[in-house]
């Protein structure tokens, strides 16, 4: 596949696919009944538009962009999704007390369009 296309956002700063952090409590996430700690999570997620060839992950994403321009009602634009993840450890409730559990796909590390 060709090299990933550039990181210049034609829509203006902060409008295109990027990593965004949202502070969320266990209650916000609906986790309060099974997670004990941390009580607050800095959730990193991928948000923003995928115009032109912006951060196209692969050739398929480039094709999708081109076809979306031609047939916007039929072919959706590429979506902004995590390219990789940061792991996170939670202290959670168990039948016998508490335990640690590692989740390796919980937090986005970086983003691309696919």
């Amino acid at each position: 596949a060709r090299a990933r296309n550039g990181d210049h956002c034609p829509l203006g700063p902060g409008r295109c696919c990027r990593l965004h952090t949202v502070r969320a409590s266990l209650e916000d996430l609906g986790w309060a009944d099974w997670v004990l700690s941390p009580r607050e999570v800095q959730v990193t997620m991928c948000i923003g538009a995928c115009p032109s060839q912006f951060r196209a992950a692969n050739m398929h994403a480039q094709i999708k962009t081109s076809l979306h321009r031609l047939k916007p009602d039929t072919v959706p634009a590429p979506c902004c999704v995590p390219a990789s993840y940061n792991p996170m450890v939670l202290i959670q409730k168990t039948d016998t007390g508490v335990s640690l559990r590692t989740y390796d796909d919980l937090l986005a590390k970086d983003c691309h369009c696919i």
């Epitope: 004990l36 700690s37 941390p38 792991p87 450890v89 939670l90 640690l100 390796d104």
Partner: antibody
Framework: EVQLVQSGAEVKKPGESLKISCKGS????????IGWVRQMPGKGLEWMGV????????IYSPSFQGQVTISADKSISTAYLQWSSLKASDTAMYYC????????????WGQGTLVTVSS | QSVLTQPPSVSGAPGQRVTISCSGS????????VNWYQQLPGTAPKLLIY???NRPSGVPDRFSGSKSGTSASLAITGLQAEDEADYYC??????????FGGGTKLTVLG
């Protein structure tokens, strides 16, 4: 500046009790977990357990479950490691360490407390 | 016996490149991340690399980490006398216990 300052070296006899401390400063103490790590003389690092100072939830390595107690007093930003009956094999350097934001690594370490147990 | 296997020692001359390996299994390194710590003689460990290949601020870019399959590596380029230390890898096992490698003593020759 983030700092973890541990209590001083201890020399004890087998069967005695001991409580060592780790005081955190330069950050919100209740926002980060604290772990304890043992290093026996000339040996590697062994994870003992973790505490969430906010809710005082503790989890122990199976190797240390029932052998030690980890606690914290958030009002004075201090975590503790204690033994009710020391053995000669408890002779080691003990480190407290702060967990990074995602709980997956130790980003700051105390200077260590050397515990010597000898009759 | 450590869950993660490291060579007991490695050595290199100043300016050289050395690598330290850390071998695990499909229940730890294979599916999770690896962190590396440096322990200079007589001091506490210090975080060197986290999440396979990230350097905390203040760590020189001579230090780099990588992971492939069930193994990880720490590379040190432009070796300096002050790099002489013990190096430990760390990950988790299947029950989310934190596990360390046995440690590798790096000797800078000459």
């Amino acid at each position: 500046e983030v700092q973890l300052v541990q209590s001083g070296a201890e020399v004890k006899k087998p069967g005695e009790s001991l409580k060592i401390s780790c005081k955190g400063s330069g950050y919100s103490f209740t926002s980060y977990w604290i772990g304890w790590v043992r290093q026996m003389p000339g040996k590697g690092l062994e994870w003992m357990g973790v505490i969430d100072p906010d809710g005082s939830y503790t989890i122990y390595s199976p190797s240390f479950q029932g052998q030690v107690t980890i606690s914290a007093d958030k009002s004075i930003s201090t975590a503790y490691l204690q033994w009710s009956s020391l053995k000669a094999s408890d002779t080691a350097m003990y480190y407290c360490a702060r967990y990074g934001r995602y709980g997956t690594y130790f980003d700051y370490w105390g200077q260590g407390t050397l515990v010597t147990v000898s009759s | 016996q450590s869950v993660l296997t490291q060579p007991p020692s490695v050595s290199g001359a100043p300016g050289q490149r050395v690598t330290i390996s850390c071998s695990g299994s499909s229940s730890n390194i294979g599916v999770l991340y690896v962190n590396w710590y440096q322990q200079l003689p007589g001091t506490a460990p210090k975080l060197l690399i986290y999440s396979n290949d990230n350097r905390p601020s203040g760590v020189p870019d001579r230090f780099s980490g990588s992971k492939s399959g069930t193994s990880a590596s720490l590379a040190i380029t432009g070796l300096q006398a002050e790099d002489e230390a013990d190096y430990y890898c760390q990950s988790w096992d299947s029950s989310s216990n934190y596990v360390f490698g046995g440690g590798t003593k790096l000797t800078v020759l000459g």
